[in-house]
């Protein structure tokens, strides 16, 4: 399943970097995110449950990120005009069945306000 | 697993239209592909196989495709500037397992020869 | 193509001990989750113990408790469980079998692939 | 601990013929966690269905499952030759646990 565009402020801006955010329902208990800039993977955390409810969390593609009962953040430093491309929040819902995949993305802008060194 | 940017001619223009290739490995057996401009679903075509492998297609969002043991081939017709995008092959494979999802894509750049109705 | 291929299984007098292994292949190892189940010949089936991806969640069923150790190494793509205290009951054919999303966890996910299974026999 | 009873025990049916195998838990099975598998002599299982009604990468169109809470049933709808075997359903909502079994048989 692929939502599209993403209904929520997706990109907030601070310090010349970005913070990303990808949601998911909150009643997800384990699941797999993946940060898509295009195509290529840029991060990938993973949560996993065991019994007594510890939880495990897997960064494959290791990102700064910040996890929420609801979303994961994550961030991106030192933005410059490359960083400009559509940006995908892929997540894997492995918990509660069925397994779901969905697709949420949009287009990061870079405005000269939100570089991290301009020129004075 | 994904792929990134289409290591393939992705894009095949003829009469004022273009062929969008969209490929997957000859041994899946049923599969989602969906094509993306930016982060909106413009098609969705899912194959599934039943008893005596009798193949099920299903077409969410109906565009023109063409189908073979190896790709999907989506057509848009009547191009025009507007075209110009990011487009995005997003595969979910079901059989064999384990699920996976691939998202390949490139960016369609129009130029005057290509569109469908240029003025004289 | 993926195989789950257990070994270890033998007989053994109650109260020895014996170490099954499950060697897998044609798989990313630690994508999965992975569980020990047991069959009693011509009987159901019983789920042993399950571990994550990396090893730190673990679990048992009530049976084992304290008696059985699940581990796993993924640098050599092998499963683990260590079997203390044996039991007459305890006599069945083990499988391990592997979480069928590739999600890294045991808990709360069904599976798919399994082994062909090896056989413990506890008896004097 | 949740207990899974499947009934009937044994089912004796003709190939071509609907197969309707019941697994009733003795407490609620949360948000659906309950797999059903196949089994055949001297093989491992092989999942069919998860969360109650969901096939199988593989599986054939003619299995399907339903239910939910403390009652769960597997349809196959026209028995094939090779569907003649043991069926076990499963909760993974907590520690797994898996019903008796129903054999299905050739009449």
């Known amino acids: 399943e692929i939502n599209g565009s993403a209904n929520y402020e997706m990109f907030i801006f601070h310090n010349g970097g970005v913070q990303i955010l990808c949601k998911y329902p909150d009643i997800v208990q384990q699941f797999k995110m993946q940060l898509l800039k295009g195509g290529q993977i840029l991060c990938d955390l993973t949560k996993t449950k065991g019994s007594g409810n510890k939880v495990s969390i897997k960064s494959l593609k290791f990102c700064h990120s910040q996890l929420s009962n609801n979303s994961v953040s994550f961030f991106l430093y030192n933005l410059d005009r490359s960083h400009a491309n559509y940006y995908f929040c892929n997540l894997s819902i492995f918990d509660p069945p069925p397994f779901k995949v969905t697709l949420t993305g949009g287009y990061l802008h870079i405005y000269e306000s939100q570089l991290c060194c301009q020129l004075k | 697993e994904i792929n990134g940017s289409a290591n393939y001619e992705m894009f095949i223009f003829h009469n004022g239209g273009v062929q969008i290739l969209c490929k997957y490995p000859d041994i899946v057996q049923q599969f989602k592909m969906q094509l993306l401009k930016g982060g909106q679903i413009l098609c969705d075509l899912t194959k599934t196989k039943g008893s005596g492998n009798k193949v099920s297609i299903k077409s969410l969002k109906f565009c023109h495709s063409q189908l073979s043991n190896n790709s999907v081939s989506f057509f848009l017709y009547n191009l025009d500037r507007s075209h110009a995008n990011y487009y995005f092959c997003n595969l979910s494979i079901f059989d064999p397992p384990p699920f996976k999802v691939t998202l390949t894509g490139g960016y369609l750049h129009i130029y005057e020869s290509q569109l469908c109705c240029q003025l004289k | 193509e993926v195989q789950l291929v257990e070994s270890g299984g033998g007989v053994v007098r109650p109260g020895g001990s014996l170490r099954l292994s499950c060697a897998a292949s044609?798989?990313?190892?630690?994508?999965?989750?992975m569980s020990w189940v047991r069959q009693v010949p011509g009987k159901g089936l019983e789920w042993v113990s399950g571990i994550n991806w990396n090893g730190d969640n673990t679990d048992y069923a009530d049976s084992v408790k304290g008696r059985f150790t699940i581990s796993r190494d993924n640098a050599k793509n092998s499963l683990y469980l260590q079997m203390n205290s044996l039991r007459a009951e305890d006599t069945a054919l083990y499988y391990c079998?592997?979480?069928?999303?590739?999600?890294?966890?045991?808990?709360?996910?069904?599976?798919?692939?399994w082994g062909q299974g090896t056989l413990v026999t506890v008896s004097s | 601990e949740i207990v899974l009873t499947q009934s009937p025990g044994t089912l004796s049916l003709s190939p071509g013929e609907r197969a309707t195998l019941s697994c009733r838990a003795s407490q609620s099975v949360s948000s659906s966690y309950l797999a059903w598998y196949q089994q055949k002599p001297g093989q491992a299982p092989r999942l069919l269905i998860y969360?109650?009604?969901s096939r199988a990468t593989g599986i054939p169109d003619r299995f399907s499952g339903s239910g939910s809470g403390t009652d769960f049933t597997l349809t196959i709808r026209r028995l094939e030759p090779e569907d003649f075997a043991v069926y076990y359903c499963?909760?993974?909502?907590?520690?797994?646990?898996f019903g008796p079994g129903t054999k299905v048989d050739i009449k």
């Open positions: 499963q909760q993974y909502g907590s520690s797994p646990f």
């Open positions: 969360g109650a009604s």
């Open positions: 044609g798989l990313t190892f630690d994508d999965y989750g």
């Open positions: 079998a592997r979480d069928y999303y590739g999600s890294g966890s045991y808990y709360n996910v069904p599976f798919d692939y």
